[in-house]
């Protein structure tokens, strides 16, 4: 079995869900903690929509352009 | 309690291939990028793989770029690592890891000898 | 890619001492530094994430300092449990780790 160490890496998206959209989701998360620069890796991680890093929870989130919505940012939103 | 259980590894000539699984439980798997990382025999850690929550980013290191593929199955709770065109310098044990970034929890790990 | 190059390699040292070991990134990564700790046959563990975040559990004597290329991991008094293998990794560019450095006892 790993070792027993708790993450500050919680991995779970802030805009994690499909069908959520990821401004949105993010800006209700800004309580949680503040935000950088993603690192270099992560640079196309976002698809159509902006990177940032969860400084409390070192991932990456997306912050959706308009008329965008997703996980990465990856889908249309029908709705828009 | 978390726990990441890795499988598949043994012996395989040069060439040939393998397939490595994690079995992860005691956490919400679907939420949390996995990674893997290995070790040759006495040496240092060497990053290998990540994939996001959604199976949907992947990425490399420029060692095994085009000869393995990270993959995910969040109905089994199981991460993969498809290794073909094994060299002997592949020869390491293979852990899986949560994080993309940061690995909080390891595997065990399990070794893969490539060897004639 | 960026390379992380450890020092020293090994040390010998007592129980009590302060120990530090220093970790420079062949280019700047902000603060995109962990330092992990790993005993013979055992996994990993984290122990510092984001060049001086304590990782949850992992004992105070345990700091990081450091930005931008050098990074420096202190434990101030160290322990019999301490003796170990110690690796920073880079999250910036793709994640590489440090060559190691192995604390042994003096």
């Known amino acids: 079995d790993g070792n027993s160490t708790r993450s500050p890496e919680t991995n779970g998206l802030l805009c994690g869900d499909p069908e959520e959209n990821c401004a949105a989701t993010t800006t209700q998360s800004k309580r949680k903690g503040h935000f950088s620069r993603c690192p270099k890796q992560y640079k196309h991680y976002c698809i159509k929509g902006r990177c940032r890093f969860v400084v409390a929870e070192q991932t990456p989130s997306c912050v959706c352009d308009e008329g965008y919505i997703g996980a990465r940012c990856e889908r249309v939103d029908l709705f828009y | 309690e978390v726990q990441l259980l890795e499988s598949g590894g043994g012996l395989v000539q040069p060439g040939g291939s393998l397939r490595l699984s994690c079995a992860a439980s005691?956490?919400?798997?679907?939420?949390?990028?996995i990674s893997w990382v290995r070790q040759a025999p006495g040496k240092g850690l060497e990053w290998v793989s990540y994939?996001?929550?959604?199976?949907?980013?992947?990425n490399y290191a420029d060692s095994v770029k085009g000869r393995f593929t990270i993959s995910r199955d969040n109905s089994k709770n199981t991460l993969y690592l498809q290794m073909n065109s094994l060299r002997a310098e592949d020869t390491a044990v293979y852990y899986c890891?949560?994080?993309?970034?940061?690995?909080?929890?390891w595997g065990q790990g399990t070794l893969v000898t490539v060897s004639s | 890619d960026i390379q992380m190059t450890q020092s020293p390699s090994s040390l010998s040292a007592s129980v009590g001492d302060r120990v530090t070991i220093t970790c420079r990134a062949s280019?700047?990564?902000?603060?995109?530094l962990g330092w992990y700790q790993q005993k013979p046959g055992k996994a990993p563990k984290l122990l510092i994430y984001?060049?001086?975040s304590l990782q949850s559990g992992v004992p105070s004597r345990f700091s990081g300092s450091g930005s931008g290329t050098d990074f420096t991991l202190t434990i101030s008094s160290l322990q019999p449990e301490d003796f170990a293998t110690y690796y920073c990794?880079?999250?910036?560019?793709?994640?590489?780790f440090g060559q190691g450095t192995k604390v042994e006892i003096k």
């Open positions: 280019q700047g990564i902000i603060s995109y």
């Open positions: 890891a949560r994080g993309g970034s940061l690995f909080d929890y």
């Open positions: 005691g956490f919400t798997f679907s939420r949390y990028w």
């Open positions: 994939i996001d929550s959604w199976g949907s980013y992947t």
């Open positions: 990794q880079q999250y910036d560019a793709l994640n590489t």
């Open positions: 984001a060049a001086s």
